[in-house]
């Protein structure tokens, strides 16, 4: 789970490692503060929880890709 | 070490209701969802709903909508499963599971509630 | 919905020997979210395999799970005499509904 120490700054001590699918997943948004001590994507899921996530894993890039094009697609 | 408890054997009237809990011990209640299952007299097993307390969400299996309610107590860490209409097909053992509603696997199972539907 | 079946709905075996169990899906089922559980007569289903292959805490060795898409195996390597009972399959990656093979019974030969 994401750790917020000193709000605004929340950053992941711990990445899951599970791959979660897309079916799953809501938004994402990347961690890339200096103040963290790595680089990381949190995934919101459907169901409300915050996963931490390796922005290197392939799973990863390719679920925020997904993301990206459906944040893209408008609904019609 | 997780644990679910569920309440003891009924015997019901025909056309009436039961409620079923499952009381959850030694994890994080709102963290997880709760799925109910049951098995009728050397049958498989089918599932019914589930609920997940920290999105707000409950699902049916459609078979069941409109006759079962899944609810949750996070107070008590409580989940309940009431099934309206009762017939004698509804004879069962009644199961609630604990799952992560990230994935789906049931990780831990309460021991079972054996409802008796008989006029 | 995504429907699952078991086969054999039956299967003799000796202790000591390969138990190989079979679920084929209706479709792909995504991401291997597919679980196997064990049932002893008069007991809960316990979990023994999530995302196809993965063994749940505790679970012995002798237990493998692989498979993809649609069709997904168990493998018991050495049957042990605990392991003769009802083995299931559940597919998690559409909810609703959860949905369980109707089962294989392993049983003593």
């Known amino acids: 789970q994401p750790d917020a120490i000193n709000a605004p700054v929340t950053c992941c001590y711990n990445f899951t490692n599970r791959k979660i699918s897309v079916q799953r997943l809501a938004s994402y948004r990347r961690i890339t503060s200096s103040k963290c001590p790595k680089e990381a994507v949190i995934f919101k899921t459907i169901v409300a929880k915050e996963i931490c996530a390796d922005p290197k894993q392939k799973w990863v890039q390719d679920s925020m890709d997904h993301l990206d094009k459906q944040t893209q697609t408008p609904k019609t | 070490q997780v644990e679910l408890v569920q309440s003891g054997a009924e015997v019901k009237k025909p056309g009436s209701s039961v409620k079923v809990s499952c009381k959850a011990s030694?994890?994080?209640?709102?963290?997880?969802?709760i799925s109910w299952v049951r098995q009728a007299p050397g049958q498989g097993l089918e599932w019914m709903g589930a609920?997940?307390?920290?999105?707000?969400?409950?699902h049916y299996a459609q078979k069941f909508q409109g006759r079962v309610t899944i609810t949750a107590d996070e107070s008590t860490s409580t989940a309940y499963m009431e099934l309206s209409s009762l017939r004698s097909e509804d004879t069962a053992v009644y199961y609630c599971?604990?799952?992560?509603?990230?994935?789906?696997?049931?990780?831990?199972w309460g021991q079972g509630t054996l409802v008796t539907v008989s006029s | 919905d995504i429907v699952l079946t078991q086969s054999p709905a039956t299967l003799s075996l000796s202790p000591g020997e390969r138990a190989t169990l079979s679920c084929r899906a209706s479709?792909?089922?995504?991401?291997?979210?597919l679980a196997w559980y064990q049932q002893k007569p008069g007991q809960a289903p316990r979990l023994l395999i999530y995302?196809?292959?993965s063994r749940a805490t505790g679970v012995p060795a002798r237990f493998s799970g692989s498979g993809s898409g649609t069709d997904f195996t168990l493998t018991i390597s050495s049957l042990e005499p605990e392991d003769f009972a009802v083995y299931y399959c559940?597919?998690?990656?559409?909810?609703?509904?959860?949905?369980f093979g109707q089962g294989t019974k392993v049983e003593i030969k």
């Open positions: 599971a604990r799952y992560d509603g990230i994935y789906g696997e049931l990780d831990f």
């Open positions: 030694g994890g994080t209640f709102s963290s997880y969802g």
């Open positions: 609920i997940n307390p920290l999105a707000g969400h409950t």
């Open positions: 479709q792909s089922v995504s991401d291997a979210y």
């Open positions: 995302d196809a292959s």
């Open positions: 559940q597919q998690y990656i559409t909810y609703p509904p959860f949905t």
